[in-house]
Amino acid sequence: MALNSGSPPAIGPYYENHGYQPENPYPAQPTVVPTVYEVHPAQYYPSPVPQYAPRVLTQASNPVVCTQPKSPSGTVCTSKTKKALCITLTLGTFLVGAALAAGLLWKFMGSKCSNSGIECDSSGTCINPSNWCDGVSHCPGGEDENRCVRLYGPNFILQVYSSQRKSWHPVCQDDWNEAYGRAACRDMGYKNNFYSSQGIVDDSGSTSFMKLNTSAGNVDIYKKLYHSDACSSKAVVSLRCIACGVNLNSSRQSR
Amino acid sequence: IVGGESALPGAWPWQVSLHVQNVHVCGGSIITPEWIVTAAHCVEKPLNNPWHWTAFAGILRQSFMFYGAGYQVEKVISHPNYDSKTKNNDIALMKLQKPLTFNDLVKPVCLPNPGMMLQPEQLCWISGWGATEEKGKTSEVLNAAKVLLIETQRCNSRYVYDNLITPAMICAGFLQGNVDSCQGDSGGPLVTSKNNIWWLIGDTSWGSGCAKAYRPGVYGNVMVFTDWIYRQMRADG
């Protein structure tokens, strides 16, 4: 997520993906600023301020800052623009900074919902975190119940949200099988994809797990999961829904 | 791609070329047999209609891309909070009419998982058929180049992008310039390798010129959008 979270001074800051932020990640910038940038062709006008150039094939209307998506096109900024730009930006920069700071706080505090309430995308209503992933749909679109599973970290560790504890926990490998893996992949959005499900040693130091209650009968996978502080196999589920991220070079290396 | 090299077959198997009117317009990244990640600015009106788009996968040369070999697009989903002026939330999804068949030359890239840590100057790669010099033409062959992530704090400094970078963006390149994405690379991948797996870190979005000093490439920060992506995939069908 490209936010610099604090980390040991010797190593310096990291880009960390916190994942599962309340939507939408970042508010549009304040109305005073957007007038400054307009989509514009791929030409450069030397200036202390960047030409804003989306990298796509584009042409456009009278710019203030030349905005260039990264896709081919062409037109140049005039020096008038440059002057207007400097004035607007001095003002703009301050306002953007303030608005971004406020906007981010607002977003990270749980959108327009107070405390850690969760907003339903479909209706904009707020629901209590204890009702999120509790097996009962509280959002009209059911999104409080279909975002209860995620893959975590570079080892694809399957985590399930506990509405009791209001936090994510790895799934213990005990009694886990491929069918559950397929169901979890489906719930994440991988309709017809499933690659592998295996137990890996949990090196995260987790002391809290979600375990399968095998006697729960033929019910929804999440209704079978219960909270446990122990995992006898000492392994957590690593789930890959799709054989991704392998190119010819890396497949050669891995042989 | 400026300052890159032509790609070998299968090196970037998730890279697609997105055509309108038989012209390469944007790049994209395969994430499942049916779904492509690209940039929202690629699909601004009137190009939000799916039938305008044809995706080509596993083909390195533009001249080998003809309509019958392409994949028609069924659906175009632009991020609801995309801002065309600031390029904030510059990400979109395309669903293909029929699923891609994976092989050595056509494979998906991994979406980043929450909890993944990247070094401030993580080594990454960019690829695409964009211009190989500023104001240049689209490239006939797929090119790729090595770039480094640039911390947002540094990228937002007064001498670089002066607070234009939001947390939904990520900068990559070199402050001395020379290597960068360029026009025509939009929507394409910024990837990094971790645990011998390639992860989609960004989608090519914008920049000031191409490969200029203190003007690195700016990419949509895919890490921020993984939940939104999964939600679109879930909601579909």
């Epitope: 081919p72 | 009117q21 009137p46 209609n49 799916p50 039938w51 029929k98």
Partner: antibody, heavy 117, light 112 residues
Framework: QVQLQQPGAELVKPGASVKLSCKAS????????MHWVRQRPGQGLEWIGI????????NYNEKFKSKASLTVDKSSSTAYMQLSSLTSEDSAVYYC??????????WGQGTTLTVSS | DIVMSQSPSSLAVSAGEKVTMSCKSS????????????LAWYQQKPGQSPKLLIY???TRESGVPDRFTGSGSGTDFTLTISSVQAEDLAVYYC????????FGGGTKLEIK
Amino acid sequence: QVQLQQPGAELVKPGASVKLSCKASGYSFTTYWMHWVRQRPGQGLEWIGIIHPNSGTTNYNEKFKSKASLTVDKSSSTAYMQLSSLTSEDSAVYYCARLLWDYFDYWGQGTTLTVSS
Amino acid sequence: DIVMSQSPSSLAVSAGEKVTMSCKSSQSLLNSRTRKNFLAWYQQKPGQSPKLLIYWASTRESGVPDRFTGSGSGTDFTLTISSVQAEDLAVYYCKQSYNLYTFGGGTKLEIK
């Protein structure tokens, strides 16, 4: 070679429905979008809608949304257009046409629909 | 909705003459990404289905005689037949595909 075959004529009564067909051959049916176009006697061409044979994704001209329904049968490489609640106003020649990029490169011969009691 | 206007609605010329017909759209049909226009010309001979002549405003479809030329950009387009032949008797339609699809009213070409 590419061919789009349509029956020459259909005669139906007012208030009824009709399903017009367009059988494609000579190319990969599921690769190309298919369009339907109407031409009333002595009039110009009007775009009705578009369908993709692989997924069945459709898009309609607002004017025809409640009148026309597009479907396909992949197994027989045939596109269909159902027209409902027919009146004499619906009497016209109906064409199917294949989309290449953003233009119609092949057209069927057209079906003349006559709505009459 | 984009409105397509064609003029004249009909014209009569002798074989061998040069003919131009106009098509105007209510908004620009230029795709700034590809620098091509979303405009095509079709020929419909009496009793036949339409046939593609020109696409992207100026690209001639293969097999179309080179006496047919499309030109223009943005909102104003022209179809020119440099030397009309008897078999060119037809109605000519322009069509936009910038936003959905709309045909012009047609120009009827008659041979004197």
